[in-house]
């Protein structure tokens, strides 16, 4: 049979290297030789390129080399397939070399901030050595912060006569390290060069861009004063490398601004002892270049009633994230403060907190929380300067099977009944939320039975047992990941009861 007609012809001019055309050869049943027929020099010259490879995949491409390539130029390319049964020709294809030229990438040699110009870096590069002198080049510059994985892109063109191979990238974050890469193409071409090697550069430092402020209210002491733990951190979106030399804090009773107290610290938290009335706390951070904007927080009076609006809250794990969702009865509340810390018996030292706006859910990557640890999560509604009553739940980012089963006892042994009791597994051993307990029991040499009860139940009465029979009993505590058995206990039912 005749060879299949070559289809999908595609050509690329690897500038000053070769012009390579490829095609889809179709299903070959016998050895097929391909000849690429070309007219060039605007139709004034023609020649052929014949594939000489023995492997079929390499036979579907052919290259022309200098000096028989000119640009600008118009080509016609036709592929002929020949086997023992005859010759078949492809459609004639037409190519403008400027449209299919592909150059080497440019070389970035410097990325630097420009003195006194904020949030900008200047990129300097060398044009690819092998690029058509008669064409302008277009460029794509891609950039990202060092700790990000998603690139941003900006496109621009340079005139071929332009000696100045620089670009000013603006609108960046201050004092942030960026990764830069550049690619180029002949202005008329659809083929971009590969990306250049990446180069790093950093924007200039600025004054700190702001703070987020929070508090932990503790019960009033005997003298009526109340300890308040102030917590703060860099505002979201602040540069990772932003330096802070210290913090200025000032606070005063809401009723009397004249009683302002000020203090300085280099720590990221501070314990204040305030009177029973409401207070305002303000703070700024500073470095050698200036001060941040002021962050302000109102501390309510001890007897002040806080509003309640969260009606229901639940946590679940989805796609490597812990998701907390809640429902609110107050439509005007759209800012929430989330607090979370491990539920350990000691005083919580590692309190984490984060605000959420315009949403009634909060997500955290699973790997930011310890697996098999129970976390207390509280959500505070915030309306203007008021903080509402929190709603709290417990959740695990990842559950495991309990590391030990329940400690079990047998009580009230009767002729046909017995009470099985067990203790809650210590928090540190649960590894997840206990969702149920299963009691397994079996008469000596007999068939096994089981009964499952919910996690609020810590005892269960077995009935319809056999008189004067030895039993073995075991209680399993289960989380969503599976269950762990406690130790097994033996008991023997009585032969008769005092009531008989």
């Amino acid at each position: 049979a005749l060879p299949a007609k070559p289809e999908n012809i595609s050509c690329v001019y690897y500038y000053r290297k070769n012009l390579t055309c490829t095609w889809s050869p179709g299903k070959e049943t016998s050895y097929t030789q391909y000849t690429v027929k070309r007219t060039y020099a605007f139709g004034e010259k023609h020649d052929n390129c014949t594939t000489n490879s023995s492997t079929s995949e390499n036979r579907a491409s052919c290259s022309f080399f200098l000096p028989r390539i000119t640009i600008p130029d118009n080509y016609t390319i036709e592929v002929e397939a020949e086997n023992g049964d005859g010759v078949i020709k492809s459609h004639m294809t037409y190519w403008r070399l400027e449209n299919i030229a592909k150059t080497e990438p440019p070389k970035i040699f410097r990325v630097k901030p420009v003195l006194g110009i904020k949030r900008m870096i200047q990129i300097e590069w060398i044009k690819p050595e092998l690029a058509p002198v008669s064409s302008d080049l277009k460029y794509t510059l891609r950039f990202r912060t060092v700790n990000s994985t998603s690139w941003m892109e900006v496109n621009f063109a340079k005139n071929r006569k332009d000696k100045n191979q620089t670009y000013n990238l603006t609108g960046l974050q201050p004092f942030t390290e960026y990764v830069i890469a550049l690619r180029c193409a002949v202005k008329e071409s659809k083929f971009w060069s590969d990306w250049s090697q990446e180069k790093m550069g950093m924007t200039e430092e600025e004054a700190p861009c702001g703070l987020e402020l929070w508090r932990v209210l503790k019960p009033a002491e005997a003298d009526g004063r109340r300890p308040v733990r102030l917590l703060w951190k860099k505002a979201r979106g602040a540069p990772v490398l932003e330096k802070t030399l210290g913090y200025n804090i000032w606070y005063y009773p809401e009723s009397n601004t004249n009683l302002t107290e000020t203090m300085n610290t280099t720590n990221q938290q501070l314990e204040l002892h305030l009177g029973g009335e409401s207070f305002w706390v303000s703070m700024i951070s500073y470095n050698s270049l200036g001060k941040s904007p002021v962050a302000t927080l109102r501390i309510p009076a001890i007897q002040e009633k806080s509003f309640q609006c969260i009606e229901v809250m639940q946590a679940c794990v989805a796609e490597d994230q812990l998701v907390v969702k809640w429902q609110s009865s107050a439509l005007d509340v759209n800012t929430w403060m989330i607090e979370w810390f491990p539920d350990v018996d000691s005083e919580p030292t590692t309190l984490s907190w984060e605000s959420v706006s315009q949403a009634t859910n909060w997500t955290i990557q699973q790997d930011k929380l310890k697996p098999f640890w129970c976390y207390n999560i509280s959500v505070y509604p915030m309306l203007h300067d008021k903080v509402g009553e929190p709603y709290s739940i417990q959740a695990y980012a990842k559950e495991g099977v309990p590391s030990e089963g329940p400690e079990t006892k047998v009580e009230n042994i009767g002729v046909k009944t017995v009470t099985i009791t067990w203790k809650e597994i210590p928090k540190s051993e649960r590894k997840g939320i206990i969702c149920n307990y299963t009691i397994f029991y079996q008469a000596e040499g007999g068939k096994g039975f089981s009964k499952t009860v919910n996690s609020s139940i810590l005892q269960y009465g077995l009935e319809s047992l056999k008189r004067k029979t030895s039993y073995i009993v075991q209680v399993m505590a289960s989380t969503s990941a599976g269950g762990t058995n406690g130790t097994s206990i033996n008991f023997k039912t009585l032969s008769f009861s005092v009531f008989e």
Epitope: P67, L130, S134
Partner: antibody, heavy 121, light 107 residues
Framework: QVQLVQSGAEVKKPGASVKVSCKAS????????LNWVRQAPGQGLEWMGL????????DYNPQFQDRVTITADESTSTAYMELSSLRSEDTAVYYC??????????????WGQGTLVTVSS | DIQMTQSPSSLSASVGDRVTITCQAS??????VAWYQQKPGKAPKLLIY???TEAQGVPSRFSGSGSGTDFTLTISSLQPEDFATYYC?????????FGGGTKVEIK
């Protein structure tokens, strides 16, 4: 800047061979074709052949086909022209010359300084 | 092979003169002609290619014209540094051939 520096003058006996080198600098060696042209004393220019250092492809003037070999060493950016079976009429200045224009194939834009080869018994 | 016949083989002219050198190809070579200038003891220098395109850095007094088989190099106003030998060359395909040269001397 683009430069082609050729090896020094040679004196050879008839029947011998000569190998002239041409070291390129200031550009991407594999991106341009190198030609060899000779000029006998008081005579015109005669093209001998070319090499494309990118793929090692050569093209020779049929007049020299069986006597000339043009090679290129990418690692040193150097091209070589070897002419064998020398006779007295091969006495000439031998030039290497690089093409340079995208829209002008086979044009000789940059030339070496020339190498005088004298064939004499 | 394509033969290139150049004329005249020599000419005498004065500074400021308009000088014309012609070259005839033995077959149609479209516009694939280049012109070179060579001074004694020096390598040739490319002046014109594609019959009429000036090479980089070439003074505008040098111009080329023609297509097919007949080509011309014109120096509009001869300068002292223009006294040299001029060669035409076809760059249609290999083998490349040159004209015999035209020596421009001071009158």
């Amino acid at each position: 800047q683009v430069q082609l520096v050729q090896s020094g003058a040679e004196v050879k006996k008839p029947g011998a061979s000569v190998k002239v080198s041409c070291k390129a600098s200031g550009y991407t060696f594999t991106g341009y074709v190198l030609n060899w042209v000779r000029q006998a004393p008081g005579q015109g220019l005669e093209w001998m052949g070319l090499i494309n250092p990118y793929n090692g492809g050569t093209d020779y003037n049929p007049q020299f086909q069986d006597r000339v070999t043009i090679t290129a060493d990418e690692s040193t950016s150097t091209a070589y022209m070897e002419l064998s079976s020398l006779r007295s009429e091969d006495t000439a200045v031998y030039y290497c010359a690089r093409d340079g224009y995208d829209d002008g194939p086979y044009t000789l834009e940059t030339w070496g300084q020339g190498t005088l080869v004298t064939v004499s018994s | 092979d394509i033969q290139m016949t150049q004329s005249p083989s020599s000419l005498s002219a004065s500074v400021g003169d308009r000088v014309t050198i012609t070259c005839q190809a033995s077959e149609d070579i479209y516009s694939f002609v280049a012109w070179y200038q060579q001074k004694p003891g020096k390598a040739p220098k490319l002046l014109i290619y594609n019959a009429q395109t000036e090479a980089q850095g070439v003074p505008s007094r040098f111009s080329g014209s023609g297509s097919g088989t007949d080509f011309t190099l014109t120096i509009s106003s001869l300068q002292p540094e223009d006294f040299a030998t001029y060669y035409c060359q076809h760059h249609y395909d290999s083998p490349l051939t040159f004209g015999g040269g035209t020596k421009v001397e001071i009158k």
